[in-house]
Amino acid sequence: LTCLGGFASPGPVPPSTALRELIEELVNITQNQKAPLCNGSMVWSINLTAGMYCAALESLINVSGCSAIEKTQRMLSGFCPHKVSAGQFSSLHVRDTKIEVAQFVKDLLLHLKKLFREGQFN
């Protein structure tokens, strides 16, 4: 079961539903972006492989005061089996490149759409 906290989800949902909603939230962010997302904040780039959800959360959680990605942070926490806090990098294996949050979101969205199309919901 996938359970996403906060107001993101009404309770446990199938993994495919959770992934669908995460994709839609990232689409929302990219479509509604006017000014630079999160004031152009930089985050660690991640490998879009196993442990990707925790790694994405560990990278994004270090961005504070950016309401545009708060829902995404909450949704990602539903995919990550362990608690993630700022400054934690257990899943973030490679920390050599920083990119803007906007680019991070676009890259993540493209990859999640690919997983969804391929039926990789877990």
């Epitope: 079961l1 989800s9 009404p10 949902v13 199938p14 993994p15 495919s16 539903t17 669908r20 909603e21 994709i23 839609e24 689409v27 929302n28 479509q31 969804f116 039926g119 919901f121």
Partner: antibody, heavy 118, light 107 residues
Framework: EVQLQESGPGLVKPSETLSLTCTVS????????WNWIRQPPGKGLEWIGY???????YYNPSLKSRVTISRDTSKNQFSLKLSSVTAADTAVYYC????????????WGQGTTVTVSS | DIQMTQSPSSLSASVGDRVTITCHAS??????LSWYQQKPGKAPKLLIY???DLHTGVPSRFSGSGSGTDFTLTISSLQPEDFATYYC?????????FGGGTKVEIK
Amino acid sequence: EVQLQESGPGLVKPSETLSLTCTVSGGSISSDYWNWIRQPPGKGLEWIGYISYNGNTYYNPSLKSRVTISRDTSKNQFSLKLSSVTAADTAVYYCARLAKWTWYFDIWGQGTTVTVSS
Amino acid sequence: DIQMTQSPSSLSASVGDRVTITCHASQNINVWLSWYQQKPGKAPKLLIYKASDLHTGVPSRFSGSGSGTDFTLTISSLQPEDFATYYCQQGQSYPYTFGGGTKVEIK
């Protein structure tokens, strides 16, 4: 109360494109997921695909190469196009809503019958 | 794709009977199963979701159970308006798939 109404030609020639529209009243297509489902005569239901509140689409892989779902937010409508039809595409076509965070179809149109024949 | 198999494909019953319909999934779908009722010439109507949760306005004589791969729809006391075809649907993964249907006829 959200209501759905399908419309479109009841007869389509083989190899042509089937085009249907679903009009949504009592709600906005800028929320939730809007689906097409079909039912061949005397058979079960087949999910075709959806268009999301963001305009994102996802199609059943078995039909993906022939299907396009689009929307017109100004008219609160979404549409289905199915190309290169054959007699096997003869069915009752339903539009249906899937609410955010759900995976079941809670509101359906009454359905429209499409026959593929020359 | 996840295959959904319903049994029986049809059954005859009388008003007041207890009716049970089963649905089998080709792989584990947890509790992500819904049931629909369809009458001739009409669209399907949602009865049950999450295997056992009754949709708004659905009479309490309908109930659902099961998890994993095997599920059951039960009508505790069949009413005249319940003669219809019933379909299960899985929501575990895309593409969403339906069972072949079970037609409940008057004996």
